[in-house]
Interface confidence: low
């Protein structure tokens, strides 16, 4: 039975109706919601404000690579992992929803999939979409964010993510990379970048760049498995460089700092 094929959804507007089927025990509900009363989101906003208030002046001090490279990449991996259990299905999941890395440093956006049938190699597609609204600006003006997001919450729509959920026609959409078998192909915009798909379906950047901010969708496509939760997404955010990120943002992992 041919069904949703390329991009079976993982979100609905209301965030309702999620289920975890017992035959898919490795599936998990969505780990994080960005709305005003979420403590972790508040910590992220507060931390971002602290970075700005400090004028990004603390820097990395003695680190020789710090000169002329005063930026930090915050990688928020907000992944949608509802699960359904049709007879033949792909299930896409992620292992680590939070990362912090430094601009020009490597980052891996984890994505793994499992299939109920494997007669042919599936295609892994990573697609970039720009944010629906400016997450960085919002991070430094939490009051306006709280007002909007609390309004959504009050409207009975707590699953709404204003940074991710909007029509593609009003934002930039690009294919980052695709993989079938051992062959990885970069999208036109990313040609020349040191980007690849490693492991099961992880997207790895050897060096992050300013233009990498946005939402990254991992999709797995198979002609045999045309149902299920074959999509997850991650948010990648680029901010100014500073020290103390790990302390400011508990639960985030700082990437390696290399010369």
């Amino acid at each position: 039975m041919q069904q949703d094929g390329l991009g079976v959804g993982t979100r609905n507007g209301s965030g309702k109706g999620r289920s975890v089927h017992p035959s898919w025990p490795w599936c998990a509900p969505r780990p994080l919601r960005y709305f005003g009363r979420d403590a972790r989101a508040r910590r992220a906003q507060t931390a971002a404000m602290a970075l700005l208030a400090g004028g990004l002046s603390r820097g990395l001090g003695s680190h020789p690579a710090a000169a002329g490279r005063d930026a930090v990449v915050f990688v928020w991996l907000l992944l949608s992992t509802w699960c359904t259990a049709p007879a033949r299905a792909i299930q896409v999941t992620v292992s680590n929803p939070y990362h912090v890395v430094i601009l020009f440093q490597p980052v891996t956006l984890p994505c793994t999939y499992q299939m109920t049938s494997t007669p042919t190699q599936p295609i892994v597609i990573w697609k970039y979409k720009s944010f629906c609204r400016d997450r960085i600006a919002d991070a430094f003006s939490p009051a306006s964010v709280d007002n909007q997001l609390n309004a959504q919450l009050a409207a009975g729509n707590p699953g709404y993510n204003p940074y991710v959920e909007c029509q593609d026609s009003v934002r930039t959409v690009r294919v980052v990379a695709t993989k079938q078998g051992n062959a990885v192909t970069l999208g036109d915009y990313y040609q020349g970048r040191r980007i690849t798909i490693t492991g099961n379906a992880d997207l790895t950047f050897d060096q992050t760049a300013w233009g990498d901010s946005g939402v990254y969708y991992c999709s797995v496509v198979s002609a045999q498995d045309l149902q299920g939760n074959n999509e997850a997404y991650a948010e990648l955010i680029v901010l100014g460089r500073t020290s103390g990120v790990a302390e400011l943002l508990p639960g985030f992992q700082a990437g390696p700092i290399e010369d």
Epitope: G5, N12, P86, I125, V175, T185
Partner: antibody
């Protein structure tokens, strides 16, 4: 049996907006990507817009990008196409079509922009 | 856009092959469909989807096959099958694209 019934066509004015609705039955609606495909008089088929099963992914053909919005209501088994700033070249029969590799079509609804 | 011949012709009982190429440009895999339109303005009918799947109401003499990036619609024992046949493919995740159509004359 799978049925797809389009409605909302008719005579439209340039610069105006139209809203087409497709009512589906006979299958588990939320499992399927849904599409709008159109055919101008004496022309070939043109893919207009698509939306995946749970509404998290939409895409649009180049001719309507920025003017079209596709949405769906899985509870009502309907998919809607909103097309703004209508042009004469939007005159066509609009078909609702099921699946990422289309396996079922509606009978179509005719839209005339004049 | 997809590439398919503008027209093909056959005698009744012969086998016809119509090719289509150019799909799947975004990610190296190919998902084609074939759609028959008997007359302008009539709704298309799916003959083949997902390269080689045939809807239950379509005769078995219609088949699809994929070789590399080219899909072929084969009609074995052509009958009153005069129509325009469009090939379609998935382009960039959920977007679709169609060929210009092939007119089959019997």
């Amino acid at each position: 049996a799978v049925t797809l019934d389009e409605s909302g066509g008719g005579l439209q004015t340039p610069g105006g907006a139209l809203s087409l609705v497709c009512k589906a039955s006979g299958f588990t609606f939320s499992d399927y990507q849904m599409n709008w495909v159109r055919q101008a008089p004496s022309k070939g088929l043109e893919w207009v817009a698509g939306i995946n099963g749970r509404s998290s992914w939409t895409d649009y053909g180049a001719a309507v990008k920025g003017r079209a919005t596709i949405s769906r209501d899985n509870g009502q088994s309907t998919v809607r196409l909103q097309l703004n700033n209508l042009r004469a070249e939007d005159t066509a029969t609009y078909y609702c079509a099921r699946g990422s590799s289309i396996d079922a079509w509606g009978h179509g609804t005719e839209v005339i922009v004049s | 856009a997809l590439t398919q011949p503008a027209s093909v012709s056959a005698n009744p009982g012969e086998t016809v092959k119509i090719t289509c190429s150019g799909g799947g440009s975004y990610y190296g895999s190919y998902y084609y469909g074939w759609y028959q339109q008997k007359s302008p303005g009539s709704a298309p009918v799916t003959m083949i989807y997902n390269n080689n799947n045939r809807p239950s109401n379509i005769p078995s003499r219609f088949s699809g096959s994929l070789s590399g990036s080219t899909n072929t619609l084969t009609i074995t024992g052509v009958q009153a099958d005069e129509a325009v046949y469009y090939c379609g493919s998935i382009d960039s995740n959920i977007a679709g694209v169609f060929g210009a159509g092939t007119t089959l004359t019997v």
